[in-house]
């Protein structure tokens, strides 16, 4: 069967006026997963995103991540989109005072 991913969105300061937002998916099976950033509901191009490889996490499941750099103050325009085993979900960027956003999908 399939194990749905835990999705976690974090933010970190990148440079003056910019932040890096990272979307991590973990503990999922099988390994095929779509993870991509959107701005105003539209997919970002590949060349504006960075992906980690899909790697085994030691528990028979997998983990991966995708990151992009955005302007501070525009966080609400960006969402991380996930598709896995026929299910999908969308995850917002947390506000500045909250650095973690977890979701487990069934």
């Amino acid at each position: 069967g399939s194990v749905p991913p835990m999705v976690n969105v974090t933010r970190s300061e990148a440079s003056e006026g910019n932040i890096t937002v990272t979307c991590r998916a973990s503990s999922f099976y099988p390994r095929n997963i779509t993870l991509t950033w959107r701005q105003d509901g539209v997919s970002l191009s590949h060349d504006t995103q960075q992906w980690g490889d899909v790697l085994p996490d030691g528990n028979g499941t997998y983990q991966t991540w995708v990151a992009t750099r955005i302007c501070q103050g525009e966080e609400q325009r960006f969402t991380c989109y996930m598709e896995h085993s026929g299910n999908h979900s969308t995850h917002p960027v947390p506000s500045g005072n909250s650095h973690h956003h977890h979701h487990h999908h069934h």
Epitope: N32, T34, R38, S45, H46, W51, E83, S85, G86
Partner: antibody, heavy 120, light 107 residues
């Protein structure tokens, strides 16, 4: 077995609209994207747009004002609608499943295509 | 949009030949490149993805290489069923764009 099959009107009059249906089997539209690509006679391929598992759409900006892509998950169908057709919209229209895995994004299974001729 | 150029629109080769098809992008596409095969009757098939990866079921005589703006598809030992048109496609930037195609024929 993953399959996609396009069905369209064949002939469309200039300035009219085009509706094509892509019926899929072997996978769920809920969790995978479908793309539309066309090919004018004797020419290359042109990406029109796509619809994701959650129903979000991305379009080729050159055609965005005339295009609409939607779907019905329960009927396993994806719909392409294009308005204000002109003779240079004459083409074979394909739907193709999109596989988007990290750095990899490709159209792994294609329908046979449906030919649309714009003529009065 | 990124322009994809396949300078050779058609080529003739003998069965068993090694055939190389070139594709160039108008800017660096960071290996975000796929190749498709279109048979004369119109059927389209994924041949290579992410520059050099072979999908299951594609014969090992097909290979892809390249980086930056220049990419190529090689058929190491041309077979009769390889008679088709071949298209490169970038997905570095939206919209994805295709080359004009290279038609491979038998001498």
């Amino acid at each position: 077995q993953v399959q996609l099959k396009e069905s369209g009107p064949g002939l469309v009059a200039p300035s009219q609209s085009l509706s094509i249906t892509c019926t899929v089997s072997g996978f769920s539209l809920n969790g995978q994207g479908v793309n539309w690509v066309r090919q004018p006679p004797g020419k290359g391929l042109e990406w029109l747009g796509m619809i994701w598992g959650d129903g979000s759409t991305d379009y080729n900006s050159a055609l965005k004002s005339r295009l609409s892509i939607s779907k019905d998950n329960s009927r396993s169908q994806v719909f392409l609608k294009m308005n204000s057709l002109q003779t240079d919209d004459t083409a074979r229209y394909y739907c193709a499943r999109g596989a988007h895995y990290g750095k990899r994004w490709y159209f792994d299974v294609w329908g046979a295509g449906t030919t649309v001729t714009v003529s009065s | 949009d990124i322009q994809m150029t396949q300078t050779t629109s058609s080529l003739s080769a003998s069965l068993g030949d090694r055939v190389t098809i070139s594709c160039s992008a108008s800017q660096n596409i960071n290996n975000y490149l796929n190749w498709y095969q279109q048979k004369p009757h119109g059927t389209v098939k994924l041949l290579i993805y992410y520059t050099s990866s072979l999908p299951s079921g594609v014969p090992s005589r097909f290979s892809g290489s390249g980086s930056g703006t220049d990419y190529s598809l090689t058929i190491s030992n041309l077979e009769p069923e390889d008679i088709a048109s071949y298209y490169c496609q970038q997905y570095s930037k939206l919209p994805p764009t295709f080359g004009g195609g290279t038609k491979v024929e038998i001498k």
